[in-house]
């Protein structure tokens, strides 16, 4: 058997570091027996077998220019071996983030915090902690480990799924290479990581007969849990065209009446989420969707809310369906003070 | 010879944005993350923002958080720190640093000063 | 984030004194903790990296101990120019922390 501990990577490779000395090993030869080493392709004798090193070649003070391809060989000149040596650096801690976009699964991204010039993978799992006693605050590792499934393709992502909302979890991401590990260990709690998707299938309608008011609708993202035991809340921004500053309300639910738009011009509307009970962060902002305030003259009657409010005679088509869920939405008033004011100004 | 060289500080309103670079030469750059450390007139040193070699992962301090942009080109072998709605309390030197392992700074530039103010 | 917390902020020694600066970390940091001198004027300079590595060209007088959240600095003979400030700092996790400083003057 060769007196070579095979490293991680290729095999025929031996790894040393930039500035360290080195030492590369034959691997054809019984440990202890005497060669001779070459440089591949040159004739010039490196370390003779009297050197009294046995099967190893000793690089003091390593340097790019000590990389590449070594010939070994025994004293009857047979081919001890052929060992190529690449330099590199031993793995630093890696950078580990984590996100959310439901309460029941998060994903660990990383990237290496220092390249090593060597090859190198990735370990990756997760511990569920604990807390210990009724009144510490102290945590323990209690549960696992347990592997944190890595995306395939190569792609630096692993997924937790089935976490547990109320729990905290150590994120293990250990970078490995020839000449060494290193572990970077992250706490983490789905309640601050939680970030939803943005909310999708916004639309902005006119409402007709009122020429200061936009109907805006949405549903829950894709990506929250079908029947959720924890309910969304959402933040919607508007503003007329060529306006800078967007104005924000917080709806109560899955629509909202604008009734301060500026007749006549479009307007921008986008949404964003986060859980009803503020754990994590609001979500990115949707895609803006547009729509401009009605200029049509106002009914002669004052139509009951659900007339104003008719269906467009075709759906406009949204990413996902919405998931059934309990209206947050209450019931929309009758006309108020707000909507007199408005039909006395557009009569005016 | 291994140098950071920052550039790009100097007198700005409050609310105003900025840009600072940081020239690295005498290293591989690229295989580094980059860091920006500040100190203020006469106080202590407060890290700033960090970036992987890649550029894919960045972390920031909470007082910059959203108003700062830290980024990197490595073909330019350039750090850059985009500021932006600068505050009286941003006024600091602001050190350009190359870490081993994330934090440990083996490698500092010698400062380029932002002042803000009306 | 992880608070420094550094003592004496500031010290007067003589020539030749063994000078001792303590750092605590407001968790456990392992041995991820470095000290740095500072100089007026002038950028830092890495003197200690892993609690007690001597960073590679610094003189022998200065040491460094500890792990979890007590560590010590440590200068055996202190000489002229090592007046400075000095700087304990974590790198645990990845928002690094400073220590508020420790000022070193001669007496």
């Known amino acids: 058997s060769s007196p070579c501990p095979q490293a991680w990577g290729p095999p025929g490779v031996q790894y040393g570091q930039p500035g360290r000395s080195v030492k590369l090993c034959c691997p054809g030869v019984t440990a202890g027996d005497p060669v001779s080493w070459f440089r591949d392709g040159e004739p010039k004798l490196l370390q003779g077998p009297d050197s009294g090193l046995g099967h190893e070649l000793v690089l003091a003070q390593a340097d790019s220019t000590d990389e590449g391809t070594y010939i070994c060989q025994t004293l009857d000149g047979a081919l001890g071996g052929t060992v190529t040596l690449q330099l590199g650096y031993p793995p630093a801690r890696p950078v580990v983030s984590c996100q959310a976009a439901d309460y029941e699964n998060f994903s660990c991204t990383w990237s290496p915090s220092q390249i090593s010039g060597l090859p190198t993978r990735y370990l990756t799992s997760y511990r569920k902690k604990t807390v210990l006693g009724a009144d510490s605050q102290r945590r323990s590792p209690s549960t696992g480990p347990w592997p944190c499934p890595q995306d395939p393709l190569g792609a630096a992502r692993c997924v937790v799924h089935g976490a547990e909302f109320w729990s905290q979890y150590r994120i293990n991401v250990t970078e490995v290479n020839p000449l060494g590990a290193s572990t970077r260990l992250l706490d983490v709690s789905l309640q601050s990581i939680l970030r939803p998707d943005p909310p999708q299938g916004l639309r902005v309608e006119s409402v007709p007969g009122y020429p200061r008011r936009l109907r805006a609708s949405w549903t829950y993202p894709a990506s929250w849990p079908c029947q959720p035991h924890f309910l969304l809340k959402f933040r919607l921004q508007y503003r007329p065209a060529q306006h800078p500053a967007w104005s924000t309300v917080e709806p109560a639910g899955l629509e909202e009446v604008i009734t301060d738009a500026v007749a006549g011009l479009p307007h921008a509307v986008r949404v964003s989420a986060r859980d009803f009970l503020d754990a994590g962060t609001w979500s990115t902002w949707s895609p803006e969707a547009w729509g401009t305030p009605s200029t049509g003259t106002i009914p002669k009657e004052i139509p009951a809310w659900g007339q104003l409010h008719t269906q467009p005679e075709v759906e406009p088509q949204v990413d996902s369906p919405a998931p059934p869920r309990p209206s947050l939405q209450p019931h929309p008033r009758l006309l108020d003070h707000r909507d007199s004011v408005e039909q006395v100004a557009v009569l005016a | 010879e291994v140098q950071l060289l920052e550039s790009g500080g100097g007198l700005v309103q409050p609310g105003g944005s900025l840009r600072l670079s940081c020239a690295a030469s005498?290293?591989?750059?690229?295989?580094?993350?980059m860091t920006w450390v500040r100190q203020a007139p006469g106080k202590g040193l407060e890290w700033v923002s960090s970036?992987?070699?890649?550029?894919?992962?960045?972390q920031y301090a909470d007082s910059v958080k959203g108003r700062f942009t830290i980024s990197r080109d490595n073909s330019k072998n350039t750090l850059y720190l985009q500021m932006n709605s600068l505050r009286a309390e941003d006024t600091a030197v602001y050190y350009c640093a190359k870490p081993e392992d994330w934090g440990r700074f083996d490698l500092w530039g010698r400062g380029t000063l932002v002042t803000v103010s009306s | 984030d992880i608070q420094m917390t550094q003592s004496p902020s500031s010290l007067s020694a003589s020539v030749g004194d063994r000078v001792t600066i303590t750092c605590q970390a407001s968790q456990d940091i392992n041995n991820y903790l470095n000290w740095y001198q500072q100089k007026p004027g002038k950028a830092p300079k890495l003197l200690i990296y892993?609690?007690?590595n001597l960073q590679t060209g610094v003189p022998s007088r200065f040491s460094g101990s500890g792990s979890g959240t007590d560590f010590t600095f440590t200068i055996s003979s202190l000489q002229p120019e090592d007046i400075a400030t000095y700087y304990c700092q974590q790198y645990d996790n990845l928002s690094p922390t400073f220590g508020p400083g420790t000022k070193v003057d001669i007496k």
């Open positions: 005498g290293f591989t750059f690229s295989w580094y993350s």
């Open positions: 892993d609690a007690s």
């Open positions: 970036i992987v070699p890649s550029g894919g992962h960045t």
